[in-house]
């Protein structure tokens, strides 16, 4: 039975040209995290594997930085980076947990972080 929950940074905004940290946290389970995939819509950005470390997809390698922790740092943001991001936790023996973050990249300097929320 899957008992865990994913906490994410929720809806966030950032300025064009700036950077943002995408963070998810898995709690309420003793399952072992074997891998975390970071996806934007249906495109894989990065993998953090417990044994193999980080794999950043080549088209993002120049502006995606691994971490902190299992999170992902997006740099040199453009308005095209606006959209949904997913953290997909592969765990053993539970299976897969998914968290969602919505990022809005703003032209203006008015960019405030949204509230944290949970996805069961």
């Amino acid at each position: 039975m899957m008992t865990g929950t994913i906490e994410t940074t929720g809806n966030i905004s950032a300025e064009k040209g700036g950077s943002i940290i995408l963070q998810c946290h898995l709690s309420s389970t003793t399952a072992q995290v074997t891998q975390v995939n970071w996806e934007q819509q249906d495109q894989l950005l990065a993998i953090c594997n417990a044994d193999l470390g980080w794999h950043i997809s080549p088209s993002f390698k120049d502006r995606v930085a691994p971490g902190p922790g299992l999170g992902l740092t997006l740099q040199s943001l453009t308005v095209n980076d606006t959209g949904e991001y997913f953290c997909i936790y592969h765990t053993y023996p539970d299976g897969t947990y998914t968290g969602r973050i919505f990022l809005e990249v703003l032209e203006s300097s008015v960019a405030e972080h949204g509230a944290r929320f949970q996805i069961p």
Epitope: T34, Q35, L44, I47, N49, A50, D51, L52, G53, W54, H55, S57, P58, S59, K61, H90, Y92, P93, G95, T96
Partner: antibody, heavy 119, light 106 residues
Framework: EVQLQQSGAELVKPGASVRLSCTAS????????INWVKQRPEQGLEWIGR????????KYAPKFQGKATITTDTSSNTAYLQLSSLTSEDTAVYYC????????????WGAGTTVTVSS | DIVLTQSPASLSVTPGDSVSLSCRAS??????LHWYQQKSHESPRLLIK???QSISGIPSRFSGSGSGTYFTLSINSVETEDFGMYFC????????FGAGTKLELK
């Protein structure tokens, strides 16, 4: 065309070390990850380890810790595998595949380098 | 390490036959399973990634399925150029390969 060119066959004595090279063309190795895979005669494939040429970060299969050292020279777009304290168990073909764009699978392989350890 | 068990060890077929090769993982690996073909004296060639995703340039007669611990590579109507070794590889933890299935001419 994306290719990986490997160095020629090596005949080495037990106890010695050897360094194999893998030169990329058609892409910049800093944009991907270079792996090394061992295949002994009539046997399966064994992953040795990988390197991120952009920062030199390496990971090795536990079995090859202390046996293998992976390095790169980004100026020549080349990756290297050094094997130390060679024994007959190290006689094998060594391949350098690059990781795929979306994970730890191998989409382009070098032709392989045969290493023979014999006195 | 995660152990991948391939079966059968060898398979004799006639061109035109359709075949299924099996790869079983010692623990769940989600869809982190990839398939390769290796012909004699050649390097391996990627056929399928992530259990079922096709690879550009690979004939459509090759397909993959499965998730968790059980995976299958199917070849629909084998051609003479398909004979050789087939290996599965997992990327859920330290990378490991199966021992292979040899596809040979009957």
């Amino acid at each position: 065309e994306v290719q990986l060119q490997q160095s020629g066959a090596e005949l080495v004595k037990p106890g010695a070390s050897v360094r194999l090279s893998c030169t990329a063309s058609g892409f910049n190795i800093k944009d991907t990850y270079i792996n090394w895979v061992k295949q002994r005669p009539e046997q399966g494939l064994e992953w040795i380890g990988r390197i991120d040429p952009a920062n030199g970060d390496t990971k090795y299969a536990p079995k090859f810790q202390g046996k293998a050292t992976i390095t790169t020279d980004t100026s020549s777009n080349t990756a290297y595998l050094q094997l130390s304290s060679l024994t007959s168990e190290d006689t094998a073909v060594y391949y350098c595949p690059k990781s795929g764009d979306y994970g730890w699978y191998f989409d382009v392989w070098g032709a392989g380098t045969t290493v023979t350890v014999s006195s | 390490d995660i152990v991948l068990t391939q079966s059968p060890a060898s398979l004799s077929v006639t061109p035109g036959d359709s075949v299924s090769l099996s790869c079983r993982a010692s623990q769940s690996i989600s869809n982190n399973l990839h398939w390769y073909q290796q012909k004699s004296h050649e390097s391996p060639r990627l056929l399928i990634k992530y259990a079922s995703q096709s690879i550009s340039g690979i004939p459509s007669r090759f397909s993959g399925s499965g998730s968790g611990t059980y995976f299958t590579l199917s070849i629909n109507s084998v051609e003479t150029e398909d004979f050789g070794m087939y290996f599965c590889q997992q990327s859920n933890s330290w990378l490991t390969f199966g021992a292979g299935t040899k596809l040979e001419l009957k």
